[in-house]
Interface confidence: low
């Protein structure tokens, strides 16, 4: 099979003898061999002189063009001109490959397979990690994130392994150690899951990691309205300031003795300062 | 497209052994395991093993006892299951089976793609 | 290894009418359960995996649910063609041994009437 130089190296002036690379023949630069080298003497073996320039223009010459292919390099002979072929290819132009498995054209470890017709000499079957058909690209295998929950990605080349961030388990960091469905809150507690941590929610009264530690159920100034709050054994209760009614103290209670239905979240009225 | 097929099935004699393989295409091995199942004629499924190609690991039933050994050449996408000591017991339909393991950064533990089977019977 | 248990080995209900099948781990596997649907003479089919996520072109009539050991999948408006065979697998990985093994519940025969 015929090279493949770099996508978009120009046929004209640029030869690859790797694959994916594009190499410049003499008088052009560039990536991609795209760019003439200009030259500051402006002094050329043959060609008439440009008028914009000064400069003496090359004039058509048998290797113009670069007539080899296949990353071959041209030289002008009396009569015409002559290709000189890297490895592997052959014929007037360096046209004919001649590229078999016995030249080992596949690297790093690919295993090579004849080709099932005359335009491909050769398949290189890629071991994990390479890519490229002469398996010459390396593949970023660890760009396909497969370690979850933040966990570090190594390729070692026969094999990826992850290193777990804390907390974490399993071959790929799947295994959240703190999973609430293997994790036990306290006194009544709840396990909430969220943002990939995982928390007790714990019963009033309760507090710290697992819920095992006597909170102060006042501490989140339960009571509205400037009720005072007490605990007790069975949960919180709320003193009511003259005027307010409710658990929490949250309804006002109108002069003509009716409570109104809050016409906002319980405990906080639209113009009443959040105590 | 994605597929595993399984192929080297047959009829074996009671202590012999047998290779069966599976030609992987149309996906990366390195967010994929594969697992080896198997169902005995009118029965349930059961696992015998797993491999993480990219991790070079493999996971083995218990009852497997070290009789069956999976393999794989990933240059080639294949995997094989190495069968010793069978007995008519062994007498099912092999399943080479896509383990949906860490896409993205998400873990799912789903066997996604199924192989057709292939009959391994273990008669005298 | 973690064994499943799945419940009942047979049910039977009626077109439109809603089956529930029950599986249940030895140990606690968090969410990495997975319900496969097998029809006979074809290769199981994956239906939900984690638990309750669909697979790809699933209809919304099948339901997994549950966490730990206990897991259920529902289906709902029953059609004809959801007579098959049912199966759950599990998926569980000892950190201590740095062991991970599959596992699948005895499977459930849905009948359609």
């Known amino acids: 099979a015929p090279l493949v130089c770099r996508a978009g190296c120009s046929p004209e002036h640029g030869f690859c003898e790797q694959p994916g690379e594009c190499r410049c023949l003499e008088g052009w630069t560039g990536p991609l061999c795209t760019v003439p080298v200009s030259t500051s003497s402006c002094l050329s073996p043959r060609g008439p002189s440009s008028a914009t320039t000064g400069c003496l223009v090359p004039g058509p010459g048998p290797c113009d063009g670069n007539p080899c292919a296949n990353g071959g390099s041209c030289s002008e002979t009396p009569r015409s001109f002559e290709c000189t072929c890297p490895r592997g290819f052959y014929g007037l132009r360096c046209e004919v490959s001649g590229v078999t498995c016995a030249d080992g054209p596949c690297f790093n470890g690919g295993l090579c397979v004849g080709g099932a017709d005359p335009d491909s000499a050769y398949i290189c079957h890629c071991p994990p990690g390479f890519q490229g058909s002469n398996c010459e690209k390396r593949v970023d295998r660890c760009s396909l994130q497969p370690c979850r929950n933040g966990g570090l990605c190594l390729d070692l080349g026969h094999a990826l392994r992850c290193r777990c961030r804390a907390g974490f388990a399993g071959p790929r960091c799947e295994h959240d150690l703190d999973d609430c469905a293997g994790r036990a809150c306290a006194n009544g507690g709840t396990c909430v899951e969220g943002g990939g941590a995982h928390r007790c929610s714990c019963a009033l009264g309760f507090g710290g990691r697992d819920c095992r530690e006597r909170a102060d159920p006042c501490a989140a100034r339960p009571c509205a309205h400037g009720g005072r709050c007490y605990a007790h054994f069975s949960g919180l209760v709320c003193a009511c300031a003259p005027g307010y009614m409710g658990a929490r103290c949250e309804f006002p209670v109108h002069p003509d003795g009716a409570s109104a239905l809050p016409a906002a979240p319980p405990g906080l009225r639209p113009g009443d300062p959040q105590r | 497209q994605e597929q595993l097929v399984e192929s080297g099935g047959g009829l074996v004699q009671p202590g012999g052994s047998l290779k069966l393989s599976c030609k992987v295409s149309?996906?990366?091995?390195?967010?994929?395991?594969v697992s080896w199942v198997r169902q005995a004629p009118g029965k349930g499924l059961e696992w015998i093993g797993y491999?993480?190609?990219?991790?070079?690991?493999?996971y083995y039933a218990s009852w497997v006892n070290g009789r069956f050994t999976i393999s794989s050449h990933n240059a080639q996408n294949t995997l094989y299951l190495q069968l010793n000591s069978l007995t008519a017991a062994d007498t099912a339909t092999y399943f080479c089976?896509?383990?949906?393991?860490?896409?993205?950064?998400?873990?799912?533990?789903?066997?996604?793609?199924w192989g057709p089977g292939t009959l391994v019977t273990v008669s005298s | 290894d973690v064994v499943m248990t799945q419940t009942p080995a047979s049910v039977e209900a009626a077109v439109g009418g809603t089956v529930t099948i029950n599986c249940q781990a030895s140990q606690n596997i968090y969410s990495y359960l997975s319900w496969y649907q097998q029809k006979p003479g074809q290769p199981p089919k994956l239906l939900i995996y984690r638990t309750s996520t669909l697979a790809s072109g699933v209809p919304s009539r099948f339901k997994g649910s549950g966490s730990g050991t206990q897991f259920t999948l529902t289906i709902s408006d029953l059609e004809c063609a959801d007579a098959a065979t049912y199966y759950c697998?599990?998926?569980?990985?000892?950190?201590?041994?740095?062991?991970?093994?599959?596992?699948f519940g005895g499977g459930t025969e849905v009948v359609v009437k």
């Open positions: 697998q599990s998926y569980y990985y000892s950190s201590g041994s740095s062991y991970g093994a599959f596992a």
């Open positions: 149309g996906f990366d091995f390195s967010n994929y395991g």
């Open positions: 491999i993480d190609p990219a991790f070079g690991r493999t």
């Open positions: 089976v896509r383990v949906a393991l860490v896409v993205a950064g998400v873990a799912y533990y789903g066997m996604d793609v």
